[in-house]
Interface confidence: low
Amino acid sequence: GLNWQLQPADGHTFNNGIRTGLPGNDDVATMPSGGKVPWSLKNSSIDSGEAEVGRRVTQEVPPGVFWRSQIHISQPQFLKFNISLGKDALFGVYIRRGLPPSHAQYDFMERLDGKEKWSVVESPRERRSIQTLVQNEAVFVQYLDVGLWHLAFYNDGKDKEMVSFNTVVLDSVQDCPRNCHGNGECVSGVCHCFPGFLGADCAKAACPVLCSGNGQYSKGTCQCYSGWKGAECDVPMNQCIDPSCGGHGSCIDGNCVCSAGYKGEHCEEVDCLDPTCSSHGVCVNGECLCSPGWGGLNCELARVQCPDQCSGHGTYLPDTGLCSCDPNWMGPDCSVEVCSVDCGTHGVCIGGACRCEEGWTGAACDQRVCHPRCIEHGTCKDGKCECREGWNGEHCTIGRQTAGTETDGCPDLCNGNGRCTLGQNSWQCVCQTGWRGPGCNVAMETSCAD
């Protein structure tokens, strides 16, 4: 892969992701084979000249070859790069102002792997740009200052690949202070720092902070401050916890809008293509369970054999080819027995009883299901687990200390600094990092080399 390119040759340092030091012909790059190859290789690049912003350029690139072009930036701006490549392609995209980039000399570098659904180069200095790969289209955004910028697409695969790209100027993106030092993501002019970094410009390294410094730690979970979300309060409200929405949706204003057939906060659950099942069934585990008399993927097909018999529960009307059903029977073929209760919107009547969709229970499918463990120490009341004396927690699985003795619970509920679990013989606290003691109430010293 291209990870070998991220390790610079000795003798140069990086500042904000920019390779410094004088370029020279003695620059070398460590190639995948492990050997050193002089940068001044002949016949190893294709130059297509200056590319116009907004116009798509296409080039076939042999393996091990750079395709080079230039873009002239007349005023500082955010530029969105749309790059199309084959599904098995592996490319490195190098961008450098003023001079042609090499494996070792560049201002920005992106790694594009056609096999990956989405890819972000993991080293903090490279994570300044968001990069997504949908099918064969990669998109990333870079802030480019005035000047002539040189692009180089390096084919790190085994085969010739057809590559094309175009660039679009983004007006709405504002610049961030010092480009977040490469330690954060710039969103509308505000730095959202990656874990381990703090400050308006993400310049300060930080010790691990509970709730990322963006929330209050309480009872084992983070209560996020306004504008933040996620288990660690590390995701801005206008972003999605899973930016790819499980590969089954799009992130819009911080919420996943799921593709047909998927649901859930992160589009991680399989849903029916028509969640209503055409009003003739219920959706269970992503499949429509149809009411009698109905069939098809979405219960959209009226299914009857020999309707003139009306399932033995009605009278056939030959003039219209329809059944007039006996009392307590319904449906086009009188095959649906009327339930004694209305199954509502979360169930269908099958054989005189309500069959509930996922997450619902009760004779009329009108009660939300609780976690199966709720019944151990509580009672389920419409999706909420009401705990018996001495128990608490969402599913009534956490015992409470009574009169200073440890009965079936943990000391002081682990003080919110641990998880209460049932060991071999008793309940005990499993403390979070930085806490110890039977009740996780003793803070441990931690040393941070800032």
Epitope: Q305, D308, G321, L322, M330, P332
Partner: antibody
């Protein structure tokens, strides 16, 4: 012989709710679908939605936020409510029986069609 | 939604002539999901053909339907005076169940 009769006010003020009732006579409302269709002056037909006698509904998405179709099997009636009306809702409103016929000895052929219609009622939206 | 287009908009013919009325769908529709109606001035529409080729009660055999996929034709083989009206196609292939704009058959 099944017959349908629409009833309701012929004049509705803008932003108010249009309410129409369709009375089914000469047969039972059970075991059928019942539809509402409208036709603006000099224009074509627009399907509004249907209700199954058990209460299941299906609405035209373009009107879904404003439309409610309900059924009263005891009165052999079904009704249409269209909220927040504007002049664009001026039309002849028809109720119809929407059959689902599955011919004998054919499992998957399901035939549809509105075989019985009311004579229509004109609704004008104006202040 | 499936958009139905009907053409011609108006067909001027004499009694006894044949009238081909076209209905085109924006996406494929099963022939059994296409329905045809006839509407005369001041009257409600009347079901003509349903289920590919089934004629509704009382509809004479001079009315027939052909076609599949996206292109369908209602043919009135010998126009009678009572056949001059507006004809609508409607699809039940997917909700919403849309109608075509209609074709008016009038006397030349």
């Amino acid at each position: 012989q099944v017959q349908l009769q629409e009833s309701g006010p012929g004049l509705v003020k803008p932003s108010e709710t249009l309410s129409l009732t369709c009375t089914v006579s000469g047969g039972s409302i059970s075991s059928y679908y019942w539809s509402w269709i409208r036709q603006p002056p000099g224009k074509g037909l627009e399907w509004i939605g249907y209700i199954y006698y058990s209460g299941n509904t299906n609405y035209n998405p373009s009107l879904k936020s404003r439309v409610t179709i309900s059924v009263d099997t005891s009165k052999n009636q079904f009704s249409l409510k269209l909220s927040s009306v504007t002049a664009a809702d001026t039309a002849v409103y028809y109720c119809a029986r929407d059959i689902v016929v599955v011919p004998a000895a054919r499992d998957y052929d399901y035939y549809y069609g509105m075989d019985v219609w009311g004579q229509g009622t004109t609704v004008t939206v104006s202040s | 939604e499936i958009v139905l287009t009907q053409f011609p908009g108006t067909l001027s013919l004499s009694p006894g002539e044949s009238a081909p009325l076209s209905c085109r769908a924006s996406q494929s529709v099963s022939s059994i999901d296409l329905v045809w109606y006839q509407q005369k001035p001041g009257q409600a529409p009347r079901l003509l053909i349903y289920g590919a080729s089934s004629r509704a009660t009382g509809i004479p055999d001079r009315f027939s339907v052909s076609g599949s996929g996206t292109d369908f034709t209602l043919t009135i083989s010998r126009l009678e005076p009572e056949d001059f009206a507006v004809y609508y196609c409607q699809q039940y292939g997917s909700s919403p169940f849309t109608f075509g704009p209609g074709t008016k058959v009038d006397i030349k």
